[in-house]
């Protein structure tokens, strides 16, 4: 809207900033136990894992940045039950990794999930 | 706790994952108007900016990842007032950028702020 009033360099910097804030998969860390809905006597080491999740801004305030495609990454974690009745077990935990995002009008009931195998 | 039961490579991968999820400044995008607490007739283009904010996991559930040091980055944005009585104004908006983070027991009153000059 202001191309005639400001120098091209300033507008370019502003535009680049906007592009970088757009809705896209971003590396984020998620707490495994809370996402798995595990009871408080079961926890994981490490308790968090790095995955890509949709985030960023949309062109309209009413739209939400949400995942359109998902892959599942297997993370090796120690599952610990308290009280400690056995040796902590190394288990593969499948974590949702967002591979595609889109600005959509409403939030889904289940934006992502974690599957234990 | 499990060094005797699992091979060093597996433990190394798990440890690297854990290091990457630790509480630290992470690039994130924030919506300027909502953070400034501006009325709906004032908005910014772009509406979002990229800054570093504290995020990640702590070793204990009772701790929260919070900022311990902050710098302020000046972002050039168009401030638009509706009804449009004048040309959109290019204004410097100072945005809090977290430079240091720590796992602390309670949330601060003002985790971050945005200053208009």
């Amino acid at each position: 809207f202001a191309a005639t009033f400001y120098d091209i360099e300033t507008l370019k910097v502003i535009d680049e900033e906007w592009q970088r804030t757009q809705c896209s998969p971003r590396e984020t860390c998620v707490e495994v136990a809370s996402e798995l809905g595990k009871s408080t006597n079961t926890f994981f080491k490490p308790p968090c894992v790095n995955v890509f999740r949709c985030g960023g801004c949309c062109n309209e305030e009413s739209l939400i940045c949400m995942n359109t495609s998902t892959s599942y990454i297997s993370k090796q974690l120690f599952e610990i039950s308290v009280p400690l009745t056995s040796v902590p077990e190394l288990v593969p935990v499948k974590v949702a990794n967002h591979t595609g995002c889109k600005c959509l009008p409403t939030a889904p009931r289940h934006p992502y999930s974690i599957i234990r195998r | 706790f499990a060094a005797t039961f699992y091979d060093i490579e597996t433990l190394k991968v798990i440890d690297e994952e854990w290091q990457r999820t630790q509480c630290s400044p992470r690039e994130t995008c924030v919506e300027v108007a909502s953070e400034l607490g501006k009325s709906t007739n004032t908005f910014f283009k772009p509406p979002c900016v990229n800054v570093f904010r504290c995020g990640g996991c702590c070793n204990e559930e009772s701790l929260i990842c919070m900022n311990t040091s902050t710098s302020y980055i000046s972002k050039q944005l168009f401030e638009i007032s509706v009804p449009l009585t004048s040309v959109p104004e290019l204004v410097p908006v100072k945005v809090a950028n977290h430079t240091g983070c720590k796992c602390l027991p309670t949330a601060p009153r003002h985790p971050y702020s945005i200053i208009r000059r």
């Epitope: 309209e60 009413s62 600005c103 | -």
Partner: antibody
Framework: QVQLVQSGAKVKQPGASVKASCKAS????????MYWVRQAPGQGLEWVGY????????TYNQKFKGRVTMTTDTSTSTAYMELRSLRSDDTAVYYC???????????WGRGTLVTVAS | DIVMTQTPLSSPVTLGQPASISCRSS???????????LHWLQQRPGQPPRLLIY???NRFSGVPDRFSGSGAGTDFTLKISRVEAEDVGVYYC?????????FGQGTKLEIK
């Protein structure tokens, strides 16, 4: 200032396709969603769908799904809407409209009249 | 789809007098983010529509202050404090809270 310049009127036969264009100027094209709205003669407004020019993501009204395709060319800041398998009740003025961050369609093109007749 | 119902469909008004148009939605237009995306458009004869009010009550650029919007939830009103000759045309309410975006059937404002 913001301007949306639309292609001229078109006459098509039933079953044919039509492609309307909308050239934007005066703002950052990729920063705003582009909507398409149609208006049949003497009737009200009907939303066809929109495209996010930043990444080409589209959302269409279910009524037109399978018949409509929206695209953009960011190098020329132009949005396109193609409607296929035209019927006589597709006769309408097709408007492109820029949508602000707050949801209002703040700038409109003058419209492209599409007439479907045998 | 959200149905937007406008009343009256036709409104003959005397110049200088106030006018009021009502718009009712079949579902609440309050978004999960707390905002209400209800907008008003004006379409003068032979012209494309023009944005008057966005988000219930915010006047758009260049819109005279005789136009005002109000309402909440499912019931909304557009008021013109003193009708002028240039206000003749069709007025539409529109919602963008839900997809598809829908419009009211329009209210024709004419001078008595």
């Amino acid at each position: 200032q913001v301007q949306l310049v639309q292609s001229g009127a078109k006459v098509k036969q039933p079953g044919a396709s039509v492609k309307a264009s909308c050239k934007a100027s005066g703002y950052t094209f990729t920063g705003y969603n582009m909507y398409w709205v149609r208006q049949a003669p003497g009737q009200g407004l009907e939303w066809v769908g929109y495209i996010d020019p930043y990444n080409g993501d589209t959302t269409y009204n279910q009524k037109f799904k399978g018949r409509v395709t929206m695209t953009t060319d960011t190098s020329t800041s132009t949005a396109y809407m193609e409607l296929r398998s035209l019927r006589s009740d597709d006769t309408a003025v097709y408007y492109c409209a820029r949508t602000s961050y707050y949801g209002g369609m703040d700038y409109w093109g003058r419209g492209t009249l599409v007439t479907v007749a045998s | 789809d959200i149905v937007m119902t406008q009343t009256p469909l036709s409104s003959p008004v005397t110049l200088g007098q106030p006018a009021s148009i009502s718009c009712r939605s079949s579902q609440s237009l309050v978004h999960s983010n707390g905002n209400t995306y209800l907008h008003w458009l004006q379409q003068r004869p032979g012209q494309p529509p023009r944005l008057l009010i966005y988000k219930v009550s915010n006047r758009f650029s260049g819109v005279p202050d005789r136009f005002s919007g109000s309402g909440a939830g499912t019931d909304f009103t557009l008021k013109i404090s003193r009708v002028e000759a240039e206000d003749v045309g069709v007025y539409y309410c529109s919602q963008s809270t839900h997809v598809p975006r829908t419009f009211g059937q329009g209210t024709k404002l004419e001078i008595k």
